[in-house]
């Protein structure tokens, strides 16, 4: 059984699926295009109920080259046939078609964090969305990496419940006057690259009094 | 019709590496998943993992990771499931199959290739 | 994992007779999508495997309609209301819901 999606040439464009923010982003890169597009349509149909593709409302004559797809795609067994018209005024410049299974190809984009350091602790705060819908959780679990003078220590908090809402992570029994940089990310059991956030970093207190911090490990 | 055309026996020395083959036809390459099955002797069926074609994504069984390495070849139609460092437990017939609309549904499966691990 | 459970191991079935497979999982295949990703394959002896029936109930084409699944979330069946030469095998259930995707021990289908 399979959908023969028509004769478009997928070589000449490159996409890819990613979770941003726990929505669907896909987003495309041109190869080798002499005339770049003005804008761009973004079509789809499913392999199991092959109709005639679909316009997403969203993505019909856009100049961005990314499309939420959030609210279009939510199975992550299904085949998305999708198609990607590109335009130069009334002229179509290229087609490029591409299968994805969320599963398989979706790739997970670090959280939103920001991290507020005291004279021997850090508080690492995520921002997820308030409401992730049940088929975006996709088994992830969050890493907040902790770096100081060449030593890396990954912290694996327990989330309980969904990834929803904002979270608050405290790192330890830090050395006070002392350069620390972290980075989060979601881990997936899968052979996709991690996509780890860019360090945050900061220079802690000296210590003055002792202070302790509870864990929230 | 669709077909999956797998490669031939192997017998490989233990420590080795071995590439089995499967060659799609009668339907576009790219537009279906290919999976992987083992089955030892005598036993039943264990997934090994998944891989899109068209974009080379992958998702293996944990108990796989490091063993199987799953590829495809667009322009030859053709997956590739290489298994390293093999030992005797590697022994076993492996199954390419091909996903029908959905994923995890295998709707065409190849004759399988056996493989012996024996010093 | 997902721990895929059939019953009975060995079937031993007269021509023209019915017969009934079970498959139990360990936790709901019912996806989110609503879908229920449990399928049947038979493999006869010395051949590869060929699917029978996708999502718990549909039959693949070619298939007799004599085959019939049926089932939901954790308790399936394969039926087969007369059993034919060609049908004798091992037939196993797998489940595509929850990675990775898991197989019943299989169920041989014999003569008596």
């Known amino acids: 059984i399979s959908y023969d999606s028509p004769d478009y040439t997928d070589e000449s464009c490159t996409f890819k699926i990613s979770l941003r923010n726990f929505r669907s982003i896909l987003s495309w890169e041109l190869k080798n295009h002499s005339i770049v597009p003005t804008h761009y349509t973004l079509l789809y149909t499913i392999m199991s109920k092959p109709e005639d593709l679909k316009v997403v409302k969203n993505c019909a004559n856009t100049t961005r080259s990314f499309c939420d797809l959030t609210d279009e795609w939510r199975s992550t067994h299904e085949a998305y046939v999708t198609v990607l018209e590109g335009f130069s005024g009334n002229t179509t410049l290229f087609s490029c078609s591409h299968n994805f299974w969320l599963a398989i190809d979706m790739s997970f984009e670090p959280p939103e964090f920001e991290i507020v350091g005291f004279t021997n602790h850090i508080n690492v705060m995520v921002k997820f969305p308030s409401i992730v819908e049940e088929e975006l959780q996709f088994d992830l679990s969050l890493v907040i990496e902790e770096q100081s003078e060449g030593i890396v220590k990954k912290h694996k908090p327990e989330i309980k419940g969904n990834m929803s809402g904002n979270f608050t992570y405290i790192i330890d029994k830090l050395i006070p006057n002392t350069n620390y940089c972290v980075s989060v990310y979601l881990e997936h059991s899968d052979e996709q690259a991690v996509i780890k956030s860019p360090l945050k970093c900061t220079l802690l207190p000296p210590g003055q009094e002792s202070e302790s911090a509870e864990s929230a490990k | 019709q669709v077909q999956l055309q797998q490669s031939g026996a192997e017998l490989v020395r233990p420590g080795t590496s071995v590439k089995v083959s499967c060659k799609a036809s009668?339907?576009?390459?790219?537009?279906?998943?290919i999976e992987w099955v083992q089955q030892r002797p005598g036993q039943g069926l264990e997934w090994i993992g998944v891989?899109?074609?068209?974009?080379?994504?992958?998702k293996y069984n944990e108990k796989f990771k490091g063993k199987a390495t799953l590829t495809a070849d667009k322009s030859s139609s053709t997956a590739y499931m290489q298994l390293s460092s093999l030992t005797s437990d590697d022994s076993a017939v492996y199954f390419c199959?091909?996903?029908?609309?959905?994923?995890?549904?295998?709707?065409?499966w190849g004759q399988g290739t056996s493989v012996t691990v024996s010093s | 994992d997902v721990v895929m459970t059939q019953t009975p191991l060995t079937l031993s079935v007269t021509i023209g007779q019915p017969a009934s497979i079970s498959c139990k999982s360990s936790q709901s295949l019912l996806d989110s999508d609503g879908k229920t990703y449990l399928n049947w394959l038979l493999q006869r002896p010395g051949q590869s495997p060929k699917r029978l029936i996708y999502?718990?109930?549909k039959l693949d084409s070619g298939v007799p309609d004599r085959f019939t699944g049926s089932g939901s979330g954790t308790d399936f069946t394969l039926k087969i209301s007369r059993v034919e030469a060609e049908d004798l095998g091992i037939y196993y259930c797998w489940q595509g819901t929850h990675f990775p995707w898991t197989f019943g021990g299989g169920t041989k289908l014999e003569l008596k």
């Open positions: 009668g339907y576009a390459f790219i537009n279906n998943l």
């Open positions: 999502l718990v109930s």
């Open positions: 199959a091909r996903d029908g609309y959905y994923l995890g549904t295998m709707d065409h």
């Open positions: 891989i899109n074609p068209g974009s080379g994504n992958v």
